[in-house]
Interface confidence: medium
């Protein structure tokens, strides 16, 4: 089955700047600003565009050692980024993949809203565990706030 979860969260960072830092350079920036959440990102194949496979390594102590993500779409104009978790982490026994869509929308106050859609593709009739969705949401929030704090402290970066 397919289970869809929608998340919206706000940021004080302008949309274009957040997209550049969090999405386009996230592989480098996130392990630097949130080493407690992601220890490193390896490029397995591709140049960052659709079809690119990345391996995200988690620190010791983290539930799951790694996940592999496949980039599905990068839209620089509309600040959209789609990717799928295809291996590792929760993917395996009952979960086929997780398809994620992130859209960063500018707000009138100069900040932005992140609209995130997570589609969990389960095997057979299996359902998605609530704790998995909660953990995923908390992880995303942790990474976003770490990037946001970095950008607020480094006003010259990613402009």
């Amino acid at each position: 089955g397919v289970f869809n979860y929608e998340i919206e969260t706000t940021s004080v960072i302008p949309a274009a700047r957040l997209f550049k830092a969090f999405i386009l350079d996230g592989d480098n920036l996130v392990p630097k600003v949130a080493p407690q959440a992601i220890s490193s990102v390896e490029n397995i194949e591709g140049n960052g565009g659709p079809g690119t496979i990345k391996k995200i390594n988690f620190p010791e102590g983290f539930p799951f050692k790694y996940v592999k993500d496949r980039v599905d779409e990068v839209d620089h104009t509309n600040f959209k980024y789609n990717y799928s978790v295809i291996e590792g982490g929760p993917v395996g026994d009952t979960l086929e993949k997780i398809s994620n869509e992130i859209k960063i929308v500018a707000t009138p106050d100069g900040g932005c809203v992140l609209k995130i859609s997570n589609k969990y593709h389960t095997k057979g009739n299996h359902e998605v565990k609530a704790e998995q969705v909660k953990a995923s949401k908390e992880m995303g929030e942790t990474l976003l706030r770490a990037v946001e704090s970095y950008l607020l402290a480094h006003s010259d970066a990613y402009n």
Partner: antibody, heavy 119, light 111 residues
């Protein structure tokens, strides 16, 4: 319900070997690190080391390196803590506990295994 | 020696509030929102009471709350009850540390 169930109390003599166990249930055992935590009589909690059952990656705290061996068997969903030669100073309660979070809190805890080493 | 410092003991009367502190450094307590607190009754296994500085697991009373200022985290227990008498340990994630260290523990006595 996520649970860790430990083996029973042990009484041993100095120099003897011992292996205690911790069986996990209610979650994907291979995908969560398990820590072993020591509590000496009347003292606090000390983390001895952790293991990732999925590939048996093991990290020891410096003061326990070479003193104990941590292992795991995913087929039986069991983690182990082993001594080759016990000392009287190993007397205490040993807890296994699952690590969770981003990345690091301890929950749930096993009920503890009391180890007494005395001649 | 513990790298996370807790007072050895605190006490309070039923109905009062007590606060237990846990002081570390910017590499642990101050650097991340990853302090957790554990309650241990005599002869029992520890139990997670607070995680990520302020979050309560389901089943933990609202009388328990966590907070943090700088490099010091605090556990506050309000409306003190006899069953709160126990040892309390703090723990924090830290970067570049080879072992996972708990605070030395605080014995809470309900008078």
């Amino acid at each position: 319900e996520v649970q860790l169930v430990q083996s029973g109390a042990e009484v041993k003599k100095p120099g003897e070997s011992l292996r205690i166990s911790c069986q996990g249930s209610g979650y994907r055992f291979s995908n969560y690190w398990i820590a072993w935590v020591r509590q000496l009589p009347g003292k606090g909690l000390e983390s001895m080391g952790i293991i990732y059952p999925g590939d048996s990656d093991t990290r020891y705290s410096p003061s326990f390196q070479g003193q104990v061996t941590i292992s795991a068997d995913t087929s039986t969903r069991t983690a182990y803590l082993q001594w080759n030669s016990l000392k009287a100073s190993d007397t205490g309660i040993y807890y296994c506990v699952r690590l969770g979070g981003i990345p690091d809190w301890f929950d749930p805890w096993g009920q503890g295994t009391r180890v007494t080493v005395s001649s | 020696s513990y790298e996370l410092t807790q007072p050895p003991s605190v006490s309070g009367s039923p109905g009062q509030s007590v606060t237990i502190s846990c002081t570390g450094t910017s590499s642990d307590v101050g650097g991340y929102n990853l302090v957790s607190w554990y309650q241990q009754h005599p002869g029992k296994a520890p139990r997670l009471m607070i995680y990520e500085d302020t979050k309560r697991p389901s089943g933990v009373s609202h009388r328990f709350s966590g907070s943090k200022s700088g490099n010091t985290a605090s556990l506050t227990i309000s409306g003190l009850q006899a069953e709160d008498e126990a040892d309390y340990y703090c723990y924090s994630y830290a970067t570049g540390r080879p072992s996972r260290l708990f605070g030395g523990g605080t014995k809470l006595t309900v008078l």
